[in-house]
């Protein structure tokens, strides 16, 4: 999906009002400097691409993020403020339902959410170029 035509300010507002709190809740108990920042993004569409990938694509050691509160709110924000986004996600959602797993917070998931916090922080930068 091409995130170029999203309403970035509306997504930013959704992040600041709720998603950020949910990410903080998920990370509760984690040491500040436990994880290095290794994922980056250069502009807002790129940031959303990386955020979507880390939030919804299962990775080795972390298959359970899509059912977390921050993920569901991220999905809702993208569906509302990115034209055509929800249509591209129908197949992905069906596949996810088939492989639903028990929610387990692994160290790998915590590391992944730490990276997500960094990506969201970059997305919110006022001077980050749109394109």
């Amino acid at each position: 999906y091409d995130f170029t035509n999203c309403d970035f300010e509306k997504i930013k507002a959704a992040y600041l009002s709720t998603i950020s709190k949910d990410l903080i809740t998920y990370m509760s108990g984690t040491k500040s400097t436990e994880f290095n920042n290794t994922v980056s993004c250069s502009n807002r569409p790129h940031c959303l691409t990386e955020i979507q990938s880390l939030t919804f694509n299962p990775t080795a050691g972390c298959a359970s993020l899509a059912k977390e509160m921050f993920a569901m709110k991220t999905k809702a924000a993208l569906a509302i403020w990115c034209p055509g986004y929800s249509e591209t996600q129908i197949n992905a959602t069906q596949a996810m339902k088939k492989r639903r797993k028990r929610k387990v917070t692994t160290n790998k998931c915590l590391e992944q959410v730490s990276q997500l916090q960094g990506l969201w922080r970059r997305f919110n930068r006022p001077l980050l170029k749109q394109q």
Epitope: S20, I24, S28, K31, S32, N36, N37, S114
Partner: antibody, heavy 118, light 107 residues
Framework: QVQLVQSGAEVKKPGASVKVSCKAS????????MHWVRQAPGQRLEWIGE????????DYNQNFRGRVTITVDMSASTAYMELSSLRSEDTAVYYC???????????WGQGTLVTVSS | DIQLTQSPSFLSASVGDRVTITCKAS??????VAWYQQKPGKAPKLLIY???MRHTGVPSRFSGSGSGTEFTLTISSLQPEDFATYYC?????????FGQGTKLEIK
């Protein structure tokens, strides 16, 4: 182990600028955010701003915007905080402090006293 | 910005006493609160993060609790080295803010 070593005390006149340094060691400099916090005599701690050394992006407390500049020298693993148009109320101890993506401060510099006096 | 108000601002106590310091936030900060101890002429030292997690090397007599808008730091049995100023800090929301401090003095 992580160490943050700051430059020495400074005495400045009102209207002048001051630049405080913070040399980091014991970790990969680009991995974490560097913050600056100050404490005026008898006052609460006040967050000034932060820099991401990986791309030098800065965020500042609204109260300091326009007067503060935070920079890094990657080759020296050193962060700098420059405050301009100094006034007597800027007399304070200035600290550098380190965080990851979660913003509480588990490592601090020893502090630099900046005195603004005519 | 989120305002943090500590109470009391000054506290006199004796070695062996149990003391509690309260930190109230002007809005919900989940559990994103840290507590620091500061002695004169020294940098603050992290004691508690995530409202209740003790930092490495912090004695078990220090404990934290709370969520939402009300948080407490408890020292179960005061030791001579505990007389200092204590600050809470919220990191739920930009800009990061601190309480005004609680100075703990020997009675």
């Amino acid at each position: 182990q992580v160490q943050l070593v700051q430059s020495g005390a400074e005495v400045k006149k009102p209207g002048a600028s001051v630049k405080v340094s913070c040399k980091a060691s014991g970790y990969t400099f680009t991995s974490y955010l560097m913050h600056w916090v100050r404490q005026a005599p008898g006052q609460r701690l006040e967050w000034i701003g932060e820099i991401d050394p990986s791309d030098s992006y800065t965020d500042y407390n609204q109260n300091f915007r326009g007067r503060v500049t935070i920079t890094v020298d990657m080759s020296a693993s050193t962060a700098y905080m420059e405050l301009s148009s100094l006034r007597s109320e800027d007399t304070a101890v200035y600290y550098c402090a380190l965080t990851g993506t979660i913003n509480y401060f588990d490592y601090w510099g020893q502090g630099t006293l900046v005195t603004v006096s005519s | 910005d989120i305002q943090l108000t500590q109470s009391p601002s000054f506290l006199s106590a004796s070695v062996g006493d149990r003391v509690t310091i309260t930190c109230k936030a002007s809005q919900d900060v989940v559990t994103a609160v840290a507590w620091y101890q500061q002695k004169p002429g020294k940098a603050p030292k992290l004691l508690i993060y995530w409202a209740s997690m003790r930092h490495t090397g912090v004695p078990s007599r220090f404990s934290g609790s709370g969520s939402g808008t009300e948080f407490t730091l408890t020292i179960s049995s005061l030791q001579p080295e505990d007389f200092a100023t204590y600050y809470c800090q919220q990191y739920s929301s930009f800009t990061f803010t601190f309480g005004q401090g609680t100075k703990l003095e020997i009675k």
